[in-house]
């Protein structure tokens, strides 16, 4: 930003009127009026190049310092070329010297030389020469001083003519400052510019209303430098939740807006499935039935729990159910849906129910699902069990209704018996198995079936109440097909799969386990 | 309306004194340099003093120079011109000057003239 | 330091005439005109570049050049018959201001 003057002397703005001293009074320096497009100007001028030994003095009005620490002094002057006068007057000059000198108090007419300090002499660009001169073609030139650091209440300027012929048209005396300033939502007060030029001073900004400062972020902060001018911006603020940043200020969110957090976001639009919002939201509200999960972005729409799965069926094989279903119908508008599957068993004899989660086994957690099957084994024969698959979203614990689905299978066999080859010669197999321990109970005694591969026309049958058996009197070197079936007071549990089982031949005989 | 009016010219023998005032009206007296200038029968204008706005400073023609004292009195808006020693030659009419800016003029502002004869 | 002026010039009414003043002052420092008729004091004519005050007809003007000025009455007029006086500061430091002789201008 520019930077911005005070003024605290200008005798071109001042017509005339500032009443300077002049030393030696009227024979040096003088106040002329001149009119140009019917207005007066005004200027000090001295000319006494003819004369030798020239020590004018041309003293501004004692000047209240304020709060200026380094003032800038701008003269706008013509100077006249000596070649203009007889034999260029050797006793001519084309420069005049500048001074200042500072004080608490007005000395008013007691002009002392030796209380000032020379600034500079000053030398003009251009000189007027004699033909512009007569031509009104005078060449002003302009030429800018600095002094600081100032301490004392105020100060004087003189200039000092020394024998050149000097029109003085401007004095502007000023000190700079860094102007008011909005930026990065932060106001940086206006500030004076500091004396030395290396030094820039630090100054500290405050946000704007509704601005804030982002965690973890610089507090706003410029430099402003000695010609006035804010450099080096550090840091800045943010429009806080439910303002929005236009132009240089933060304004509130318009109804149906919102904004959750300090950023450098504008407002957005409220998302579905919420309420309108009142000027200068933060959030949305959600619409009744609607709910947002405390991890869920305020931007995002508000959701609902999900419908129950769309369509469950359960599927016995032995003493295993497959269970499938389907996505809910109505997902409640969120993508983090899961399953739970819960297991309840009544015993048909008595009706009593009761939860079956520690006796059976499923293929994978039966929380947080997020296929939709899973298998449920170890299940006791002749029990009724009614499995339940409840549907869940990001917003379901916000609800005390569930959405859940459920189906109902009876257990009419035992699970296939898990049959092995346990050893083997040229005339006897020796079979083995096993089924769930939970089953084992209901098991009357077990039925091993086997023939020769080939022959349908007749069959074997052993029972045993073990769970091995050795068949005896077989073919050497031939197969036979085995099937264990387990058998319950209520009747025959399912059967095993059917094995091929072969014996040794005679070359290989001896009791081999395989 | 701006104006100088002059009095206390007159008669006076050869070595006495006479002073004249100059009663300004219709501007403000304390912000202009004034001027004494004079004109001796039949004669050019002759500048004679000039004494500063403040009345710190003055000045003076060679020819007056000792003899003649220019002052003011701000408060009553007033010049003077004390003329001691006079001679004949000192014989002309007085015109008091207000210099339009400066100290050196132009004379933008006169007295009516008052007449001072030094005679025996 | 003086300032010269021609003792007498005459013009007639409606013509132009041109009164110099000549002085080494008046290559430092522009030269003032006025005017006095008999019995009056002087009234200011011209000062500076070449500026009139208030109620000065614009027939007057002036104009300086080196160390000569000249004051120029363009269609003079029987009213203007009068003393005319230049002046100038005095860059010698002899004399703090000087004025011409005056030169009597007569319409005929």
């Known amino acids: 930003a520019q930077g911005k003057e005070v003024v605290l002397l200008d005798f071109a703005a001042a017509g005339g009127e500032l009443g300077w001293l002049t030393h030696p009074y009227g024979k040096g320096w003088d106040l002329m009026q001149n009119i140009m497009n019917d207005m007066p100007i005004y200027m000090y001028s001295v000319c006494n190049v003819m004369s030798g030994d020239q020590d004018n003095w041309l003293r501004t009005n004692w000047v209240y310092r304020g709060e200026a620490e380094r003032i800038f002094i701008e003269l706008k002057f013509t100077v006249r070329d000596c070649n203009s006068f007889p034999g260029g007057a050797s006793s001519c000059k084309e420069t005049f010297n500048l001074y200042y000198a500072e004080s608490d108090l007005d000395y008013g007419t007691n002009f002392q030389k030796r209380l000032f300090t020379k600034i500079d002499t000053i030398a003009p660009d251009e000189i007027t020469v004699s033909s512009d001169f007569e031509a009104r073609h005078v060449k002003l030139n302009v030429e800018e001083r600095s002094v600081g650091p100032l301490t004392r209440k105020g100060f004087y300027l003189a200039f000092q003519d020394i024998g050149a012929c000097v029109a003085l048209l401007s004095v502007r005396v000023y000190y700079k400052k860094c102007p008011e300033l909005l930026q990065g939502l932060a106001h940086f007060p206006e500030t004076i510019a500091g004396s030395d030029a290396p030094s820039l001073a630090t100054v500290a900004g405050t946000c704007v209303d509704h601005a804030v400062v982002p965690p973890g972020g610089e507090e706003p902060r410029m430099h402003c430098a000695v010609d006035g001018e804010w450099l080096v911006p550090i840091g800045q603020c943010l429009c806080q939740a439910g303002y929005e940043k236009v132009e240089d200020a933060c304004q509130a969110c318009s109804p149906g807006f919102f904004k959750f957090e300090a950023s450098e976001s504008p407002c957005l639009e409220c998302p579905e499935h919420t309420l309108p919002s009142p000027e200068g939201a933060t959030s949305c509200e959600c619409e009744e039935g609607f709910f947002r999960a405390p991890q869920d972005p305020a931007s995002m729409p508000c959701t609902r729990p999900p419908s129950a799965p769309h369509y469950l069926t359960a599927v016995g094989m032995g003493a295993k159910v497959e269970l499938r279903w389907t996505p809910p119908q109505d997902s409640g508008g969120r993508e983090d849906i899961v399953y739970s599957v819960t297991c309840e068993q009544c015993w048909p004899e008595s009706g009593e129910c009761g939860p079956c989660e520690a006796s059976v086994r499923y293929s994978e957690p039966p929380h947080g699902l997020t296929r939709t099957s899973v298998t449920v084994s170890d299940l006791e024969p002749h029990m009724n069990y009614t499995f339940t698959v409840e549907a869940r979203n990001g917003v379901s614990g916000l609800v005390t209704s569930r959405s859940f689905r459920t189906a109902s299978v009876s257990i009419n066999q035992t699970e296939p018996p898990k049959v092995r080859l346990e050893g083997r010669s040229t005339t006897s197999l020796s079979v083995s198995w096993s089924i769930p321990p939970p089953q084992q109970s209901r098991v009357w005694k077990y039925e091993v079936t086997y023939r020769k591969k080939g022959d349908s026309n007749s069959y074997n049958v052993r029972r045993t109440e073990g769970f091995s058996v050795t068949l005896d009197d077989l073919a050497p070197d031939t197969t036979y097909l085995v099937q264990v079936q387990a058998l319950t007071q209520e009747g025959q549990g399912a059967g095993s799969k059917v094995h091929e089982f072969q014996t040794l031949s005679p070359e290989g005989s001896g009791n081999l386990a395989v | 309306q701006v104006q100088l009016v002059q009095s206390g010219g007159g008669l006076v023998q050869p070595g006495g004194s006479l002073r004249l005032s100059c009663a300004a009206s219709?501007?403000?007296?304390?912000?202009?340099?004034m001027h004494w200038v004079r004109q001796a029968p039949g004669k050019g204008l002759e500048w004679v003093t000039v004494?500063?706005?403040?009345?710190?400073?003055?000045y003076y023609a060679d020819s007056v120079k000792g003899r003649f004292t220019i002052s003011r009195d701000n408060s009553k808006n007033t010049l003077y011109l004390q003329m001691n020693s006079l001679r004949a030659e000192d014989t002309a009419v007085y015109y008091c000057?207000?210099?339009?800016?400066?100290?050196?003029?132009?004379?933008?502002?006169w007295g009516q003239g008052t007449l001072v004869t030094v005679s025996s | 330091s003086e300032l010269t002026q021609p003792p007498s010039v005459s013009v007639a009414p409606g013509q132009t005439v041109t009164i110099t003043c000549q002085g080494d002052?008046?290559?430092?420092?522009?030269a003032s005109w006025y005017q006095q008729k008999p019995g009056t004091a002087p009234k200011l004519l011209i000062y500076?570049?070449?500026n009139r005050p208030s109620g000065v007809p614009d027939r007057f003007s002036g104009s300086s050049s080196g160390t000569s000025a000249s004051l120029t009455i363009t269609g003079a007029q029987a009213e203007d018959e009068a003393d005319y006086y230049c002046?100038?500061?005095?860059?010698?430091?002899?004399?703090?201001?000087?004025f011409g002789g005056g030169t009597k201008l007569t319409v005929l």
């Open positions: 000057a207000r210099a339009s800016v400066g100290a050196t003029g132009p004379f933008d502002i």
């Open positions: 219709g501007f403000t007296f304390s912000s202009y340099a």
């Open positions: 004494i500063s706005p403040d009345g710190h400073n003055t």
């Open positions: 002052s008046l290559r430092s420092y522009y």
């Open positions: 500076g570049e070449n």
């Open positions: 002046n100038s500061r005095d860059s010698s430091g002899t004399h703090l201001t000087v």
